[in-house]
Each structure stands twice: as C-alpha cells, then as structure tokens.
Amino acid sequence: LTCLGGFASPGPVPPSTALRELIEELVNITQNQKAPLCNGSMVWSINLTAGMYCAALESLINVSGCSAIEKTQRMLSGFCPHKVSAGQFSSLHVRDTKIEVAQFVKDLLLHLKKLFREGQFN
C-alpha cells in the first residue's frame, strides 16, 4: 500500500494521512458514543496482523443500518485492495469469537494508534 484515494482531497493521499484520518474517525466514534454503538451489534473478532484492514472491513460490513460506522467502512475500503461485500470472509482467518462493535472499534483504534506511533503507515 503506497497511495490511497482521498475522501476529502482531489489527489492521492499519503498512507500516513489516510491512517491518521481513520484514527481520527475511530476516536470520534468512541468519544461520541452515548447509546450502545450500532445497537450492540456483534461482529467477528479479527487478528490485528497482516491483512487487518480487509479483515476489519469484512467484519464491519456485515453491520447494516448503522450510520455511526459508515464512514469507517468507506475508509477501510480504501485500505483494502480487493472489493469486499457482506458475507465475505476471505481475510477473516479465525471466526470463533464475536464481540460488540464498540469493543471492535476500541481494539482496532488501540492497534492503529500503536502502528502510527511506531511510524508503520503501510
């Protein structure tokens, strides 16, 4: 992953900027959460390793009718090189644990912040 299409800019966005915007959005979700996120919907837990972005998208895309995570879903699609549709689990190597969307977002945010602080943008 070397270059991403921007959501708010006309040209390509550097990976560090795209990751920063994803983190900002996840921070926004966690800070503004009042009622249970996505009505407490459950999603598959993922391994936060290689293929993480596609796996995260494949997990979250199965949550429908939740406007709070729609922007996150769009952003994750920019990180995933292949098209992802609901019910697709090619990147979800382990499907044995379901967690609430709120916990999923928190876990993902914690990992992405660590990657950013370490300078791992790709």
Partner: antibody, heavy 123, light 106 residues
Framework: QVTLKESGPGILQPSQTLSLTCSFS??????????VGWIRQPSGKGLEWLAH???????RYNPALKSRLTISKDTSSSQVFLKIASVDTADTATYYC???????????????WGQGTTLTVSS | DIVLTQSPASLAVSLGQRATISCRAS??????????MNWYQQTPGQPPKLLIK???NLESGIPARFSGSGSGTDFTLNIHPVEEEDTATYYC?????????FGGGT
C-alpha cells in the same frame, strides 16, 4: 497537579555522555496515550525536539541525532531518562522534559514542561 | 523535515491592540478534520507554555484573548486585546510527523 523536573550534570567535557533525568508527578506513564518528551534550547535560540517515549515503551528519536540518543523510562518511579553520547560544544543548551498532551494518542504536542536543566560543554 | 517559517521575527504592539503572528509550513499538516499545529509562549527564563493546540483549540487556563486559526500550510496566532504580560517569544510547532519541529520564534 502535573509537574516535571529535569536534572543533569551541569558541565561536561567534549566526548562525554550526557545523562538526564526527568522526574514527574500528577500523571502516570502506565496510562494509555501518555508520553514524555525531551526538547532542548541553546541560549537565545529556538527549540529542538530530541526524543519521546510512550506509555507502552514506543520510542521515537530526532533522525538528525538518533545515533547519539537513548531514551528510557522507569514507570514505577515516575522517571524518564535521556542519554546523549559524545557531546560537543553544540550540545550546550537548556534541556526540557515535557508531557505529551495529545488528543489522539500518537502525535507530539507538549502541554506541561519542566523548568529545564542547563548543560555547558567545555574543555 | 517540515520547516516552519514564522513572521514577523519581532513585533511591537500597543496595549489593547491586535498582535498577529504567522506560521507557514513547508507541507500540509492538516487532514480533512484537524490541523496538527500548536502555539507556545515563552517568557525569559521560563519554559514554553502551550497556548493553542490543533490550530484553534485554546488550552485550558489560557485567556480567551489568544486565538488560533488556519489549515494546510498557513496558520495564524492572534492576541487581542494585547496586554503587557503578553510580552514574550511565541513559537509554532507541528505534531504531524517525526521529527517534530518548531518555528524560529516571534
């Protein structure tokens, strides 16, 4: 109440190693998203960021000085340490430690500063 | 490295008037939502004090006469009305990427 205090040798000779200690209170480096950094300022000049360390031991250095810098922490005693190898007269400056006050958990802005400790490098 | 250029280098302002300090970055330090630019005040013999974070967010305990604005590469610190105790050196600093750098001061 957040406070930070730097301590150092005051005077060193060229080629010696500088050891700095930052002792802090009012926050903990075991808290998520917390970090402490070092910034220096030669007398009458501007500010230069040197290094910082995060709660989970992620360390970042100024690339221009990276080969000479080592940052570490002792969470239990609320201290952060910086070593600078092979000091020269260009390292004469006031050295500040500062708490990272990020909203997002990865960017380095500094919301509380110590009073600074002065280093003079002279033969 | 991102270079921050402050202007003017020095500034004299009458009490009660407006002081405007500019900071230009050599590349953008903004996303679509936030700008990673901060402002500090330093008086002689004292450490810097954070005034404004993320371009426009006033730090807790800082008087409302300080304000920040800008995005992308161009940022401004305004002080109005200026008081005598505001006599100091002001620095901008980006928190966009390593290495974090400071402007030369005003």
């Amino acid at each position: 109440q957040v406070t930070l205090k730097e301590s150092g040798p005051g005077i060193l000779q060229p080629s010696q190693t500088l050891s700095l200690t930052c002792s802090f209170s009012g926050f903990s480096l075991s808290t998520s998203d917390m970090g402490v950094g070092w910034i220096r300022q030669p007398s009458g000049k501007g500010l230069e960021w040197l290094a910082h360390i995060w709660w989970d031991d992620v360390k970042r250095y100024n690339p221009a000085l990276k080969s000479r810098l080592t940052i570490s922490k002792d969470t239990s005693s609320s201290q952060v340490f910086l070593k600078i190898a092979s000091v020269d007269t260009a390292d004469t400056a006031t050295y500040y430690c500062a708490r990272i006050g990020t909203n997002y958990g990865y960017d380095g802005l500094f919301d509380y500063w110590g009073q600074g400790t002065t280093l003079t490098v002279s033969s | 490295d991102i270079v921050l250029t402050q202007s003017p280098a020095s500034l004299a302002v009458s009490l009660g008037q407006r002081a405007t300090i500019s900071c230009r970055a050599s590349q953008s330090v903004s996303t679509s939502s936030y700008s990673y630019m901060n402002w500090y005040q330093q008086t002689p013999g004292q450490p810097p004090k954070l005034l404004i974070k993320y371009a426009s967010n006033l730090e807790s305990g800082i008087p409302a006469r300080f304000s920040g604005s800008g995005s992308g590469t161009d940022f401004t610190l305004n002080i109005h009305p200026v008081e005598e105790e505001d006599t100091a050196t002001y620095y901008c600093q980006h928190s966009w990427e390593i290495p974090y750098t400071f402007g030369g001061g005003t």
